[in-house]
Amino acid sequence: GSERTCCPVNWVEHERSCYWFSRSGKAWADADNYCRLEDAHLVVVTSWEEQKFVQHHIGPVNTWMGLHDQNGPWKWVDGTDYETGFKNWRPEQPDDWYGHGLGGGEDCAHFTDDGRWNDDVCQRPYRWVCETELDKASQEPPLL
């Protein structure tokens, strides 16, 4: 495939990535799948600068990101290393809280109303952000 040089319609370009901001809510897995079907992934935050950009666009609304610990360790959906990477948890988070009464703990990360991160029940219907890299080869066949 050819390299994508422009962001798709309704996506926002920033620092060689394209971002799409939902206005409805989905469970984390459904949001993850939505982004994959768009040849993208849930947003992976790698810097304070990117954090501020996303925060500016989502406003004070709970919004899923591409970080989860459903299979054990915290993992970014694109393989970015959690241990050495950027983190912006709220104080005392993540806490894998069991007190919500929904069964199990909290395995999916989201931006909170102040932009800092919290872990929550993955089934909650939050807004989400998709991201795709401009330099990534697109799935479209090259023009002959």
Epitope: D69, K87, Q93, P94, Y98, G103
Partner: antibody, heavy 114, light 107 residues
């Protein structure tokens, strides 16, 4: 590489106390809840306590409530289990484990006997 | 508290056999269940998480299924290194509870 190393086990008399430690490395310790699980000789596994990443939430099995105290020091990447009023039935290998049990230490043996 | 009833408590099998172990929860636990393998003198090792997902590095002959109250661990073709004791663990609510264990022995 994720590593959990328990220490502090040994022989103690009934009614005595012991403090177990679990030294963690290879992962961001404060991002994970931690647990203590024990196994009496020839018996099955028994969950005994959990603590959230910041220490805000703590849970105990009824069998140890009021006698054991779980704690953590995130600055030292360490998990602890303070065991008081020990009984013969507390004799077991004690394991520390991360969150829902995706990684375990090798265990430390606690023997309560007169 | 949620009780986990595991069966059988032991079984004898031969290399190549298909083996199935069951855990039943006393109330619904969604898919908040893991399966663990333990060999003598060693720490438990997680094989399956959230009832049906294979832990990284675990051979594909191990599989898990179930949701709610009935859960199954299957070994499709038993290998010499699979002779061990297996436990289920529910982490849906505190106190977390293990099944009683199933010892898989060589026939």
């Amino acid at each position: 590489e994720v590593q959990l190393v328990e220490s502090g086990g040994g022989l103690v008399k009934p009614g005595g106390s012991l403090r177990l430690s679990c030294a963690a490395s290879g992962f961001t310790f404060s991002s994970y809840g931690m647990n203590w699980v024990r196994q009496a000789p020839g018996k099955g596994l028994e969950w005994i306590s959990s603590i959230s990443g910041s220490g805000s939430y703590i849970y105990y099995a009824d069998s140890v409530k009021g006698r054991f105290t779980i704690s953590r020091d995130n600055a030292k990447n360490s998990l602890y289990l303070q065991m008081n009023s020990l009984r013969a039935e507390d004799t077991a290998v004690y394991y520390c484990a991360i969150s829902s049990g995706w990684s375990w230490g090798q265990g430390t043996l606690v023997t309560v006997s007169s | 508290d949620i009780q986990m009833t595991q069966s059988p408590s032991s079984l004898s099998a031969s290399v190549g056999d298909r083996v199935t172990i069951t855990c039943r929860a006393s109330q619904g636990i969604r898919n908040d269940l893991g399966w663990y393998q333990q060999k003598p003198g060693k720490a438990p090792k997680r094989l399956i998480y959230t009832a049906s997902n294979l832990q990284s590095g675990v051979p594909s002959r191990f599989s898990g299924s179930g949701c709610g109250t009935e859960f199954t661990l299957t070994v499709s073709s038993l290998q010499p290194e699979d002779f061990a004791t297996y436990y289920c663990l529910q982490h849906n609510s505190y106190p977390w509870t293990f099944g009683q264990g199933t010892k898989v022995e060589i026939k």
